[in-house]
Interface confidence: low
């Protein structure tokens, strides 16, 4: 029969002959011949493969590198890399978290419009109208002016962005 | 090459403030965490705390809160640890380093608190 | 606070001979993420302290692997194998894995 151009899925083509692919897990150690299949071995410890494959190299895990900031997020197998997050307080500087740098607060005027994850920044958002915050926070959002007015009380001080309104007795009735 | 260094050896009086500078080069300085750690005469290492020089926002152990102050001048790279009130017990050397996980070290800075 | 106790004040030792440093702590450090927040230093005579080991058994850039951490949960070991004078000092254990830190008391490695 004719030797074939092209092979089936999981399929590769060599020496005019198709060959199985090493699974996921495992890289190639010989390729198949005539008499024989195409031999493969499971990846060591620390390594992987995560497609159908005819490597003779496992992929090493990504390592997590706490000089970086980083930790291990989800452990590697023989068919998946290491997924690295970064330590608390901190977040990725990439797609592929390769290092972390430190989550931003929010500066007095302005509060947390979402709070910062492994892989992403603090957002923060300006405190508008009626509402403040006085503090630099990681945390904190934009906190609503005191409304003297269910406490009977009146404005004696206007808000601003950074600070509470605040709050005063009424003016007693004049003789 | 990354280095911390420290401000010089510092002889104090009770009741005096001192301030203890650690400047950084080699890297992003508010990249990192900076930690203080105290080691007093002829004693093992305490950690003091540690601040964020993106935010400047400081932690402190229990041990050291109230009198000590952390804080960073991000422009210069570099990091300060103020004592007020300086009490004997203080006499020790400090130690800037880097977090994570305390892998470079400044060379100390000796403070000596006598009447 | 978590309590980190290294019961040998000191270690003599012969050059060429292998030493064992342990080091308890009176909590677990597994922290939820899977990772032990156990490290090692050493404090050379007159210098600052220098990261050996973190994360237990993972061997700091630039140390020689002479040097090698194991343990678990509460118990943590730091072997030196073939001890060289240069490795006199004091030796810390310090926990990472919750506020405040904390050191050991430490343990002095003495060439006999």
């Known amino acids: 029969p004719e030797p074939p151009t092209a092979c089936r899925e999981k399929q590769y083509l060599i020496n005019s002959q198709c060959c199985s692919l090493c699974q996921p897990g495992q890289k190639l150690v010989s390729d198949c011949t005539e008499f024989t299949e195409t031999e493969c071995l499971p990846c060591g410890e620390s390594e992987f493969l995560d497609t159908w494959n005819r490597e003779t190299h496992c992929h090493q895990h990504k390592y997590c590198d706490p000089n970086l900031g980083l930790r291990v997020q989800q452990k590697g197998t023989s068919e998946t890399d290491t997924i690295c997050t970064c330590e608390e307080g901190w977040h990725c500087t990439s797609e592929a978290c390769e290092s972390c740098v430190l989550h931003r607060s929010c500066s007095p005027g302005f509060g947390v419009k979402q709070i910062a994850t492994g892989v992403s920044d603090t957002i923060c958002e300006p405190c508008p109208v009626g509402f403040f915050s006085n503090v630099s926070s990681a945390f904190e959002k934009c906190h609503p002016w005191t409304s003297c007015e269910t406490k009977d009380l009146v404005v004696q001080q206007a808000g601003t962005n950074k600070t509470d309104v605040v709050c005063g007795p009424q003016d007693r009735l004049r003789a | 090459q990354i280095q911390l260094v420290q401000s010089g050896p510092e002889l104090k009086k009770p009741g005096e403030t001192v301030k203890i500078s650690c400047k950084a080069s080699?890297?992003?300085?508010?990249?990192?965490?900076m930690n203080w750690v105290k080691q007093a005469p002829g004693k093992g290492l305490k950690w003091m705390g540690w601040?964020?020089?993106?935010?400047?926002?400081?932690t402190y152990a229990d041990d050291f809160k109230g009198r000590f102050a952390f804080s960073v001048e991000t422009s210069a790279s570099t990091a300060y640890l103020q004592i007020n009130n300086l009490k004997n017990e203080d006499t020790a050397t400090y130690f800037c380093a880097r977090k994570p996980p305390f892998d470079y070290w400044g060379q100390g800075t000796t403070l000596t608190v006598s009447s | 606070d978590i309590v980190m106790t290294q019961a040998a004040p000191s270690v003599p030792v012969t050059p060429g001979e292998s030493v064992s440093i342990s080091c308890r702590s009176s909590k677990s450090l597994l922290h939820s993420n899977g990772n032990t927040y156990l490290y090692w230093f050493l404090q050379r005579p007159g210098q600052s302290p220098q990261i050996l080991i973190y994360r237990v058994s993972n061997l700091a850039s630039g140390v020689p692997d002479r040097f090698s951490g194991s343990g678990s949960g509460t118990a943590f070991t730091l072997r030196i194998s073939r001890v060289e004078a240069e490795d006199v000092g004091v030796y810390y254990c310090m926990q990472h894995v919750e506020y405040p830190f904390t050191f050991g008391s430490g343990t002095k490695l003495e060439i006999k």
């Open positions: 601040i964020n020089p993106y935010t400047g926002e400081p």
């Open positions: 080699g890297y992003t300085f508010t990249n990192y965490g």
